[in-house]
Interface confidence: medium
């Protein structure tokens, strides 16, 4: 229904706390360089204005759209051009073009320092002094680094952060309590960020239809007892919600997400038997719980999918009369039977089925033509299964760090033109798939591995799009989203690449490496490994092992030396010489 004042409507629905959090996220995602203090001032002004509209919906400007109100606020920032350059040009446009312009200027890799977690004592002090400001800083710092983070989910993580700090800051050993708990929240949030970026990419590049297909497959896996029209309703709602968040309509997105949670909890009987525990929780936790819900049990004695989609003589008639509905029903029926498949795989199978019908229904004997379609799925299913098997075996053999290095070598050979920091980030993330998925039961491995890899590769594509350097990467990134992972997997050593010349300074290290945290040390070593591969793309595994082993020993030896600087200065050149020789 239409409301006189959109902003008053959202303020009333969301409540002041969530309203303020979402406005802060919105501003932080649009203007990623502004300091917290500047954003919080704008948030307060918007909140005060919303309150005047709640009191009187006919008050001046209360009838304006939220985009107009937010955009006017952003465009009134002094020195906007000095800080943001051409983003300031957006302010000359009218809505909705102005908002589109802001969206286009979101930076997936902003030039911001990595978010440093303060020391435990300092963290607890500032949290206890002003919890609201502390959590506000958290929202701001995450949102500006991840401009597509799913806003209502970020509010949930802030709530989790709050819970952890409330609990741990009363403990005697605060650090021991905080570190593992905050690490777990951080890990989940980072995965959530890449997953949501993938959803927004899907929406931006391929539109709502593609996203809705993804949602139908996912919902059908989770809720195999729900009927197709129920799944369609849920998928339509989820598509709308994601479109809003990806489009910067964060208040509407969060409001609609809460509405969907309410609907699901009121209609559990027709959706899933697993929802009750989620439905007893408060709103943010309820929505998050529903988003992560375990799969319901598959109904017993489901008939073979062949009956309706292969053996039925009316397949072509049904397909011709309502293509999207028929294909949607196929996707639903296949997905509800296969919680053990990735969504990407299910969408590839649906695409194959569609292509088969397009071809066969135009022929003389359609049933004879499409009769073998299910058998033709086999190679499409085997490919990701083999990928999971070989990669999990490698992970089990090498451990996470070793597996990351293997992936780094592989991807540097596939796309040596890509910048080393981007390759290292991608390989570290891709390598985490082992820890995340390979320890799961067999039936959960494939969906975990492939859907996670797809999200990480989307991040690689998004970064590469900004500064395209590799034709192969561009080719894989330009195609359909569901074909990306197989496309990257199929890439081999780039034969067109002219090896980088050997620069001694790339492999020169100093004593500062000794005091770095383990993660930073790993990144230094992985940076060196990528550079080695760029220098010698066809180096054998044994050659690389020798050089990297030598390098690790060198670092270890010099970090234990009495005169570290001297050791690095004298031993470093020897290491470089030995490395060149080993790779010759």
């Amino acid at each position: 229904e239409a409301h006189k004042s959109e902003i008053a409507h959202r303020f009333k629905d969301l409540g002041e706390q969530h309203f303020k959090g979402l406005v802060l996220i919105a501003f932080s995602q649009y203007l990623q360089k502004c300091p917290y203090e500047e954003h919080i001032k704008l948030v307060q002004e918007v909140t005060d204005f919303a309150k005047t509209c709640v009191a009187d919906e006919n008050a001046e400007n209360c009838d304006k759209s939220i985009h107009t109100l937010f955009g006017d606020k952003l465009c009134a920032i002094p020195k906007l051009r000095d800080n943001y350059g051409e983003l300031a040009d957006c302010c000359a446009k009218q809505e909705p073009e102005r908002n589109e312009c802001f969206l286009q200027h979101k930076d997936d890799n902003p030039n911001l320092p990595p978010f440093q977690r303060p020391e435990a004592e300092a963290m607890c002090t500032s949290f206890q002094e002003n919890p609201t400001s502390f959590l506000g800083h958290y929202l701001h710092e995450v949102a500006r680094r991840h401009p597509y983070f799913y806003a209502p989910e970020l509010l949930y993580y802030a709530e989790k952060y709050n819970e952890v700090l409330t609990q741990c800051c009363t403990e005697s050993d605060k650090a021991a309590c905080l570190t593992p708990k905050l690490d777990a929240v951080k890990e989940k949030a980072l995965v959530a960020a890449v997953r949501q970026r993938m959803k927004c990419s899907s929406m931006q590049r391929f539109g709502e239809r593609a996203f809705k297909a993804w949602a139908v497959a996912r919902m059908s896996q989770r809720f195999p007892n729900a009927e197709f029209a129920e799944i369609t309703k849920l998928a339509t709602d989820v598509t709308k919600i994601n479109k809003e968040c990806c489009h910067g309509d964060l208040l509407e997105c969060a409001d609609d997400r809460a509405e969907l949670a309410k609907y699901m909890c009121e209609n559990q009987a027709t959706i899933s038997s697993k929802l009750q525990a989620c439905c007893d929780k408060p709103v943010l936790q309820k929505s998050q719980c529903l988003a992560e819900i375990e799969h319901d049990n598959i109904p017993a004695d489901l008939p073979s999918i062949a009956a309706d989609f292969v053996e039925d003589k009316e397949v072509c008639k049904n397909y011709a009369e309502a293509k999207d509905v028929f294909l949607g029903t196929f996707l639903y029926e296949y997905s509800r039977r296969h919680p053990d498949y990735s969504v990407s795989l299910l969408l590839r199978l649906a695409k194959k089925y569609e292509a088969t019908l397009e071809k066969c229904c135009a022929e003389g004997d359609p049933p004879a033509c499409y009769g073998t379609v299910l058998a033709e799925f086999q190679p499409l299913v085997e490919e990701p299964k083999n990928l999971v098997k070989t990669n999990c075996e490698l992970y089990e053999k090498l451990g996470e760090y070793g597996f990351q290095n293997a992936v780094l070598v592989r991807y540097t050979q596939k796309a040596p033109q890509v910048s080393t920091p981007t390759l290292v980030e991608a390989a570290r993330n891709l390598g985490r798939v082992g820890t995340k998925c390979c320890t799961l039961p067999e039936a959960q491995r494939l969906p975990c591995v492939e859907d996670y890899l797809s999200a990480i590769l989307n991040r690689l594509c998004v970064l590469h799009e900004k500064t395209p350097v590799s034709e192969k990467v561009t080719k894989c990134c330009s195609g359909s989203l569901v074909e990306r992972r197989p496309c990257f997997s199929a890439l081999t050593v780039d034969e067109t690449y002219v090896p980088k010349e050997f620069k001694a300074e790339t492999f020169t290290f100093h004593s500062d490496i000794c005091t770095l945290p383990d993660k930073e040390k790993q990144i230094k070593k992985q940076t060196a490994l990528a550079e080695l591969v760029k220098h010698k793309p066809k180096a054998t595994e044994d050659q690389l092992k020798t050089v990297m082993g030598d390098f690790a020993q060198f670092v270890d030896k010099c970090c234990k030396a009495a005169d570290k600087d001297n050791c690095f200065a004298t031993e470093g050149p020897n290491l470089v010489a030995r490395s060149k020789e080993a790779l010759a």
Partner: nanobody, 126 residues
């Protein structure tokens, strides 16, 4: 949008049989669960039977008709059927066909289902 038109009603003797049909126009018949309801003279609306969106889908029946009535659908003809055997006087009613998102919710006889037909009268009398 789905438009529904019932047919097949009429006068039948106790113990006799009738087959009701419900023809749907609109391109999304396959997306909907379908059901039959009835309203006896001077009584409220009563759930009779429902079927999920596929031809071989799950079926639901009211206890009063279990074993006597059979619901089925032919998606290629966009048609829903109700085969009624061993009819009794108490089966006399106007029979309505309806479409909804879920066959399970249909059993709750919500007064506002998305799509209803106009109804066909079944009279069981000797």
């Amino acid at each position: 949008e789905v438009q529904l038109v019932e047919s097949g009603g009429g006068l039948v003797q106790p113990g006799g049989s009738l087959r009701l049909s419900c023809a749907a126009s609109g391109r999304t018949f396959i997306a909907y669960a379908m059901g039959w309801f009835r309203q006896a003279p001077g009584k409220g609306l009563e759930f009779v039977s429902a079927i999920t969106n596929f031809a071989g889908g799950t079926t639901y029946y009211a206890d009063s008709v279990k074993g006597r009535f059979t619901i089925s659908r032919d998606n290629s003809k966009n048609t829903l059927y109700l085969q009624m055997n061993s009819l009794r006087a108490e089966d006399t009613a106007v029979y309505y066909c309806a479409a909804d998102r879920s066959a399970q919710t249909m059993r709750q006889v919500r007064p506002v289902l998305p799509y209803w037909g106009q109804g066909t009268l079944v009279t069981v009398s000797s």
